[in-house]
């Protein structure tokens, strides 16, 4: 039975040309996290394997940085980066948990950032 829940940064906005940290946190389960994948719509951005580390897709290596923690940092943002992002937690024995974040990249220099998310 899957008892876990994923907390995310939710809906966030950032300024064009800037950076943003995408973060998720899995709680309420004792399942072992074996891998976390970060996806944008249908594209895989990065993999963080618990034992074998971070791997960034070659298509995104210039603009995506691992961390902090299991999070992902997007750099040099463009308006085309607006959209849904997913953190996919592969766990044992529970299976897969998915969290959703919506990022809006604004042209304005007064982009309003979502509340700062803290990992407990």
């Amino acid at each position: 039975m899957m008892t876990g829940t994923i907390e995310t940064t939710g809906n966030i906005s950032a300024e064009k040309g800037g950076s943003i940290i995408l973060q998720c946190h899995l709680s309420s389960t004792t399942a072992q996290v074996t891998q976390v994948n970060w996806e944008q719509q249908d594209q895989l951005l990065a993999i963080c394997n618990a034992d074998l580390g971070w791997h960034i897709s070659p298509s995104f290596k210039d603009r995506v940085a691992p961390g902090p923690g299991l999070g992902l940092t997007l750099q040099s943002l463009t308006v085309n980066d607006t959209g849904e992002y997913f953190c996919i937690y592969h766990t044992y024995p529970d299976g897969t948990y998915t969290g959703r974040i919506f990022l809006e990249v604004l042209e304005s220099s007064v982009a309003e950032h979502g509340a700062r998310f803290q990992i407990p």
Partner: antibody
């Protein structure tokens, strides 16, 4: 250059135990996660254990979970695979392997060591 | 776990011919696929990772492509040393699983 050298294979009876070693050189062993991959005679490849760089995290597929234990001694640049309650279906060549730097794939492999489980 | 199915099991070709090897995943693996070559008595050798990136030292005649559940390894013109068994592997979810292999043999 990266070198991985396995040892410890041999013939063992079902139900018994065996420990495999993999001696690493040519890279900073303590900075890399490591894996064991096996290949039954004439068959395909199966990842059987992984361990992170400091030994604090491990992973096993269901086929070996509870019977195999991966560990490492970073001071000796050595990876281990302790195999208990061995079965005939564990007969295989066992390779230790490392991902390439920034490479999502096993770029470095040892020569393999054959484990035969037979009565 | 994700099952990787390779086809054909055996491919009989002559040197100089083009080889097309297929790997189908049981679910979308979003380009987290690598390919290996293995010759008898040897360890596997990494050829391709992230579906289409050639590993260090791999000749340009080897190329990978694909997305979703379908991936292809192409050898544009077979050299004598290319006759071997080829495996695909997915890294999208744990456990990272391999296909059963395609043997490329001399016709």
């Amino acid at each position: 250059q990266v070198q991985l050298v396995e040892s410890g294979g041999g013939v063992v009876q079902p139900g018994r135990s065996l420990r495999l070693d993999c001696k690493a050189s040519g890279f900073t062993f303590s900075s890399y996660g490591m894996s064991w991959v096996r290949q039954a005679p004439g068959k395909g490849l199966e990842l059987v254990a992984t361990i992170n760089s400091n030994g604090g995290s491990t992973y096993y597929p269901d086929s070996v979970k509870g019977r195999f234990t991966i560990s490492r001694d970073n001071s000796k640049n050595t990876l281990f695979l302790q195999m208990n309650s061995l079965r005939a279906e564990d007969t295989a060549v066992y390779y230790c392997a490392r991902l390439g730097t920034g490479t999502l794939g096993f770029a470095y492999w040892g020569q393999g060591t054959l484990v035969t489980v037979s009565s | 776990e994700i099952v990787m199915t390779q086809s054909p099991a055996t491919l009989s070709l002559s040197p100089g011919e083009r080889a097309t090897l297929s790997c189908k995943a049981s679910q979308d693996v979003k380009t987290a696929v690598s390919w290996y070559q293995q010759k008898p008595g040897q360890a596997p050798r990494l050829l391709i990772y992230w579906a289409s990136t050639r590993a260090t030292g791999i000749p340009a005649r080897f190329s990978g492509s694909g997305s979703g559940t379908d991936y292809t390894l192409t050898i544009s013109s077979l050299e004598p040393e290319d006759f071997a068994v080829y495996y695909c592997q997915q890294h999208y979810s744990t456990p990272w699983t391999f296909g059963q292999g395609t043997k490329v043999e001399i016709k």
